[in-house]
Interface confidence: low
Amino acid sequence: GSGIFQLRLQEFVNQRGMLANGQSCEPGCRTFFRICLKHFQATFSEGPCTFGNVSTPVLGTNSFVVRDKNSGSGRNPLQLPFNFTWPGTFSLNIQAWHTPGDDLRPETSPGNSLISQIIIQGSLAVGKIWRTDEQNDTLTRLSYSYRVICSDNYYGESCSRLCKKRDDHFGHYECQPDGSLSCLPGWTGKYCDQPICLSGCHEQNGYCSKPDECICRPGWQGRLCNECIPHNGCRHGTCSIPWQCACDEGWGGLFCDQDLNYCTHHSPCKNGSTCSNSGPKGYTCTCLPGYTGEHCEL
């Protein structure tokens, strides 16, 4: 169900051990309760308990305190689960009965007699705070408290929002009190299924399949995938886009491996002669008077 109406019975007082018809119980009123929860009615009528009903075992004789009990027979608070949007209003009928029969299943015994009943009608918001109340009639007094809480994984003012925290293939989040998703660290997106990549990871050139990762797309490298990878055979060049080979100054050719500045790189001309570049690996030495040879070495 999406929520639970909880009713905590606290104390029942029937000092004279009387039934609603004025007769007395012999030897005492062995008391159990029938609870009927239904939609709000201006005038409470007989008919189905539309929000649920529950009966207790015998809880005591005449006057008694009802202890909290978490499980098994005689559980207190009583649990009335529902599987719909909590409307915020309700009608509650609590009947005290005497049984001459079985303690654990008094509901099935013949000869049960009504001791008293109370009807509560009104509004009740979902919340953890117990609303405490006490009802008296001429013969009996009942102290009790009640509340409506959402079941596990249900949230919101009417327990209508279902949210299951998860950390798996399809989402990584916890649930906020209103049922909205709160992504676990490192995840984003409507369903928290998109990892947040390493800070600074290039938006176009990098991606990630888990948080704080930066995987480079083809043609890019570096921790943040912001460095392009030049052409495979690029010798003396760089790139601004992948597989490019933009030659450094003085170099040419497809792979930037052809020396366009042989004079500077190799100083082939001797004895103060002048060196002139003339294409890849090409150069000419102009000799000073008195020198000769290809490199003015003679």
Partner: nanobody, 126 residues
Framework: QVQLQESGGGLVQAGGSLRLSCAAS????????MGWYRQAPGKEREFVAG???????YYADSVKGRFTISRDNAKNTVYLQMNSLKPEDTAVYYC????????????????????WGQGTQVTVSS
């Protein structure tokens, strides 16, 4: 209600390929995760591959690089391309659709309903 119909299973030799299809009908939206699981004899059902809300794909380590999941939103169909099949891939393959239904007043509130197909047998012989 959602109905799933798988197809494409069969007998194939090790190293071969198969393509599984799963057509979904009913209340399917784009905010729906779809995936494939498998169950070998005597073993528990295990996750194989999934494709999430934003078309993000996920794979079990044992099938990474060999299997590819994809989906056609217009046809409400999810596919599993299985290459380089191994004998240990032999199993009944189940299509799964996890419908995320927005609940009243929910900003990102979702209810999870997982629907399973009937399964299709894949047998890889050595």
């Amino acid at each position: 209600q959602v109905q799933l119909q798988e197809s494409g299973g069969g007998l194939v030799q090790a190293g071969g390929s198969l393509r599984l299809s799963c057509a979904a009908s009913g209340n399917i939206s784009t905010g729906t995760a779809m995936g494939w699981y498998r169950q070998a004899p005597g073993k528990e059902r295990e996750f194989v591959a999934g494709i999430a809300y934003g078309a993000t794909t996920y794979y079990a380590d044992s099938v990474k690089g060999r299997f590819t999941i994809s989906r056609d939103n217009a046809k409400n169909t999810v596919y599993l391309q299985m290459n380089s099949l191994k004998p240990e891939d032999t199993a009944v393959y189940y299509c799964a659709v996890e419908v995320s239904q927005s609940t009243p007043g929910g900003r990102y509130s979702v209810a999870y309903l997982i629907y399973w197909g009937q399964g299709t047998q894949v047998t890889v012989s050595s």
